[in-house]
Interface confidence: low
């Protein structure tokens, strides 16, 4: 669900009457309106309506039973632990409950599209809200691991070796804060919309034209540039020092997170550069034009759907990339396929010495 | 400056046809939803029909569904409704109005409508 | 269908008064619209969503109301007020007028 504005979406909740007030001064009603005097108005689409009703139900149904999947093995397998958690896994921990919550909006939203929005203003409010916390929430968490990475590494700082769960709930908590204050425009302005033509109801958002832009601009560099600006930085450094101290094991210990950080750009690239497109026609510096606006908005829907698949890969990249991971998913299967059978519930002789990746020598990845 | 005019219209048998067509001018006419509107003498407002940007979707009351099409020629920057199987009911002033868009999203009102042509069904 | 019943359908004040129209859904509506009517001229918007007055409307027009009940507020009559009002809906197939409110000089 990209929670943009919809062209076919019709305005009516009455908690924005207020905000709306200012409307005729951003849109004059006046005798003396014409083309040369204001920015072209956005499109309606037609087409891009009908994209959306046929490709993201089936994709979201899909991306909602993976992530749950996924992800629920990933939280299981790091709640499994005899030991604490590392700092580094107590991200991915976070990381994990993030996506969750992320697809369980999913199918909400995949009705939205299919049909129409039949929760109410109240539930569009929750799960715009939680859709754009966790949506934050995976890029900031991912930066946080990038840094701790980076600290721990480069720096030979571990800044959360004494005390590490307070420091790292501390950080966590501070992300999640974060993340709700991005969330605030989401319980503020959507609501369930009817659209009386498509006589359907619509979750979206309902503010003017600024507003649209300034949130976009939000999402682009919160939860996209700036993590990703973290996340090369750090490992650009990280694999230098390693590179150079032809640390192989460490090598080897990083594949993993940079390999998630990979896919982190990979799947939200496109997303963020048709946003990118849609803000410079926003702002005037791309002509708007209907089949421009069409190509952007079916755009939107695919490249959208290729970020959500983010939230299923990140438990298909600890499995495939993490070794550790598939050895404690195995146990944890054991485990509870046979509760009685007291050695399978004994952790794996290297355990301890893996114990901790953000906290040994060789920085080697424990839980994952 | 926006403007709207009707033409088309005019005296009819029952059971006969009319086209009404509405020139559009003064904004991107291809980005707004159009809708025609009619009012009997001395009557109130009815809606007849509304089309999106792009000609693709189309929406009728029941009291025209079967009877009315509206349709679009953009590159004329023009509204049409082909009226058929017309009754002494339909006889009114037909408007034809504009939908305004508000932050991408169409509007169910009108923020410009025309002077309006009448069409009287009378045998 | 959602009928909107204005009242009254006649409205004799003078220059000066307060005047309240009012436009009753048959079911709750998410927002109202007024529209003001000259004789022999074309509608124009007057108040949409609710309350925000059109480009052009003077400030002593005020409209209110939620749900079932919405109001058109006039708080001093001026000769140019005197016209035929009618309030809109869209939040329920199909599209619907009032019946009117015709404001006329005392």
């Known amino acids: 669900m990209v929670l943009e504005v919809s062209d076919h979406q019709v305005l009516n909740d009455a908690e924005v009457a207020a905000l709306l007030e200012n409307f005729s001064s951003s849109y004059d009603y006046g005798e003396n309106e014409s083309d040369s005097c204001c920015t072209s108005p956005p499109c309606p689409q037609d087409f891009s309506l009908n994209f959306d009703r046929a490709f993201l139900p089936a994709l979201y149904s899909l991306l909602f039973l993976l992530g749950l999947l996924g992800n629920g093995a990933v939280a299981a397998v790091l709640l499994s632990r005899r030991t604490a958690l590392s700092s580094t896994d107590t991200f991915l921990l976070h990381l994990a409950v993030a996506d969750t919550l992320l697809v369980l909006t999913l199918p909400l939203w995949a009705v939205d599209a299919a049909v129409q929005w039949v929760f109410g203003s109240g539930l569009c409010k929750v799960a715009g809200a939680l859709f754009n916390i966790n949506f934050y929430a995976g890029a900031l968490l991912l930066a946080c691991i990038s840094f701790d990475r980076y600290l721990n590494i480069v720096h030979a700082t571990q800044l959360y070796r004494r005390g590490p769960p307070a420091r790292v709930t501390l950080t966590c908590l501070a992300v999640w804060g974060l993340c709700l204050l991005f969330a605030l425009p989401d319980f503020i302005f959507l609501s369930a919309h009817h659209d009386e033509r498509l006589n359907a109801t619509h979750c979206q958002y309902n503010f003017p034209q600024v507003g649209r832009t300034a949130l976009r601009v939000l999402q682009l560099v919160a939860g996209f540039l700036l993590p990703l600006l973290v996340m090369a930085y750090c490992y650009a450094h990280i694999l230098a020092v390693l590179l150079v101290s032809r640390g192989q094991r460490r090598l080897r210990a990083m594949r993993l997170v940079v390999v998630v950080v990979v896919a982190f750009a990979l799947c939200w690239t496109p997303y963020h550069l048709v946003v990118l497109v849609d803000i410079l026609m926003d702002l005037g510096a791309l002509a708007r034009n209907c089949g421009r606006e069409s190509r952007v908005d079916v755009a939107k829907s695919v490249t959208s759907g290729l970020g959500y698949m983010h939230c299923c890969l990140n438990p298909l990249l600890y499995a495939f990339v993490g070794v550790k991971f598939r050895e404690r998913m195995w146990m944890l299967l054991l485990r509870l396929g046979c509760p009685n059978q007291r050695g399978l519930q004994r952790q794996p002789s290297s355990s301890r010495r893996d114990s901790s990746w953000s906290e040994t020598s060789e920085a080697s990845y424990s839980g994952l | 400056e926006v403007q709207l005019l009707e033409s088309g219209g005019g005296l009819v048998q029952p059971g006969g046809s009319l086209r009404l067509s509405c020139a559009a001018s003064?904004?991107?006419?291809?980005?707004?939803?159009m809708s025609w509107v009619r009012q009997a003498p001395g009557k109130g407002l009815e809606w007849v029909a509304t089309?999106?940007?792009?000609?693709?979707?189309?929406y009728y009351p029941d009291s025209v569904k079967g009877r009315f099409t509206i349709s679009r020629d953009n590159a004329k920057n023009t509204l049409y409704l082909q009226m058929n199987s017309l009754r002494a009911e339909d006889t009114a002033v037909y408007y034809c109005?504009?939908?305004?868009?508000?932050?991408?999203?169409?509007?169910?009102?009108?923020?410009?409508w025309g002077q309006g042509t009448l069409v009287t069904v009378s045998s | 269908d959602i009928q909107l019943t204005q009242s009254p359908s006649f409205l004799s004040a003078s220059v000066g008064d307060r005047v309240t129209i009012t436009c009753r859904a048959s079911?709750?509506?998410?927002?109202l619209y007024w529209y003001q009517q000259k004789p022999g001229k074309a509608p124009k918007l007057w108040i949409y969503f609710t309350s925000t007055l059109a480009s052009g409307v003077p400030s002593r027009f005020s409209g209110s109301g939620s749900g079932n009940e919405y109001t058109l507020t006039i708080s001093s009559l001026q000769p140019e007020d005197f016209a035929t009002y009618y309030c809109?809906?869209?939040?329920?197939?199909?599209?619907?007028f009032g019946g009117g409110t015709k404001l006329e000089i005392k």
């Open positions: 809109q809906q869209f939040t329920s197939s199909p599209y619907t």
């Open positions: 089309i999106s940007h792009g000609g693709t979707y189309t």
């Open positions: 079911s709750g509506v998410n927002y």
């Open positions: 109005a504009r939908h305004p868009i508000y932050s991408g999203n169409y509007q169910g009102y009108f923020d410009y």
């Open positions: 003064g904004f991107t006419f291809t980005s707004y939803a």
